[in-house]
Amino acid sequence: KGMHVAQPAVVLASSRGVASFVCEYGSSGNAAEVRVTVLRQAGSQMTEVCAATYTVEDELAFLDDSTCTGTSSGNKVNLTIQGLRAMDTGLYICKVELMYPPPYYVGMGNGTQIYVIDPEPCPDSD
Amino acid sequence: KGMHVAQPAVVLASSRGVASFVCEYGSSGNAAEVRVTVLRQAGSQMTEVCAATYTVEDELAFLDDSTCTGTSSGNKVNLTIQGLRAMDTGLYICKVELMYPPPYYVGMGNGTQIYVIDPEPCPDSD
């Protein structure tokens, strides 16, 4: 079944290459297990940036080598993507799946356009 | 309907606070003198950022203390805004007036959303 997912239209990455945004999903039921995936869309291509499953009791945990971190609170997930460069500017889509218990729901946001500007290098300190 | 003015929807300022975009106007006549004004829109308020009049023979020249520079070629004006800070993020509208000879035409673009990120300070070199 389709589920509504909301996310901001535009976010600016910091000069350190960090971008944060909230992904909010609307569900009538109380899901115990939720999977959040961040996808990057380029043309008709979608590539997975990161994904994590969390339970209502436990905190959102991405893989250690993931570019993402996050926290969850009710139907809201605060996502942070790190290590971004100017070439990573693009549309990042939040996909939410209610995994357990049934029924299974899935929803995708319209995407957050993340803009990244590479910083000027600092002058050599000599 | 006025005169059609085209400008990009989004531009990112560089980490040095410089943003450039092209403002293109469509006119049936051959204007000898064209005035270009950059306006910043905040809510229903419009404030003038900079303005310059140029002739077909001469180059576009902003005032010496202006935050803008530019070049012109036919019906295209390349605008550069300098000294931008994160707080200057906003919608910048290009207004073009065909000043001389008559008839007077005016057109305004839909605006370019300029995003500005303040750079991280470089570490002290000591």
């Epitope: - | 005169m3 005035r35 009049t53 002739t55 000043m99 001389y100 008839p103 007077y104």
Partner: antibody, heavy 114, light 109 residues
Framework: EVQLVETGGDLVKPGGSLRLSCVAS????????MNWVRQAPEKGLQLVGG????????YYTDAVKGRFTISRDNAKNTVYLQMNSLRAEDTAMYYC???????WGQGTLVTVSS | QAVLNQPASVSAALGQRVTISCNTN??????VQWYQQLPGKSPKTIIY???NRPSGVPVRFSGSKSGSTATLTIAGIQAEDEADYYC???????????FGSGTQLTVLG
Amino acid sequence: EVQLVETGGDLVKPGGSLRLSCVASGFTFSDYPMNWVRQAPEKGLQLVGGINSGGSATYYTDAVKGRFTISRDNAKNTVYLQMNSLRAEDTAMYYCATSNFQYWGQGTLVTVSS
Amino acid sequence: QAVLNQPASVSAALGQRVTISCNTNIGSPYDVQWYQQLPGKSPKTIIYGNSNRPSGVPVRFSGSKSGSTATLTIAGIQAEDEADYYCQSYDDNVDGYVFGSGTQLTVLG
């Protein structure tokens, strides 16, 4: 604050001459082509003519062609209207305005009467 | 020649909406400007390029143009709006700017 101040209006006999001046302040005068507009008593507005920003090109309404001359001095932020062979029908309030009519002066009255 | 025709006068009560038309005898492709002239004062631009309002002009003033007719609308007129209103455009025949004959707006009690 933008200001356009016209001077030189006077009572003059038919066939006489008059020179109007318009001094600009508060904006980059050399960026703006300028116009002269007149308004006869209890009548509407009528364009007299205009001049480009550099002063190299002018145009005039048919009613004044050959009699009136518009010039400018960008160093003095001033535009001029030289009026020769004046007629009774030239009696009017004369306004200077930027070519996009964004800014107007307060006007100076020219009366042509014997 | 393209003459800009305006009604000689219009009147409306305080707070009412009033429109002033400016008709050309040809479907002129050129932009129309509107000027307000308060008694004893010089004209002031209230609409340029058919529908643009200069900063400082109250939002109750708006302009539009369709075919050979340009319209100035004042939504909710105030006592201080009592003035003469002129439209202005360009005429190919005279190769210059032309003004409408002017409309006197009277605000009733």
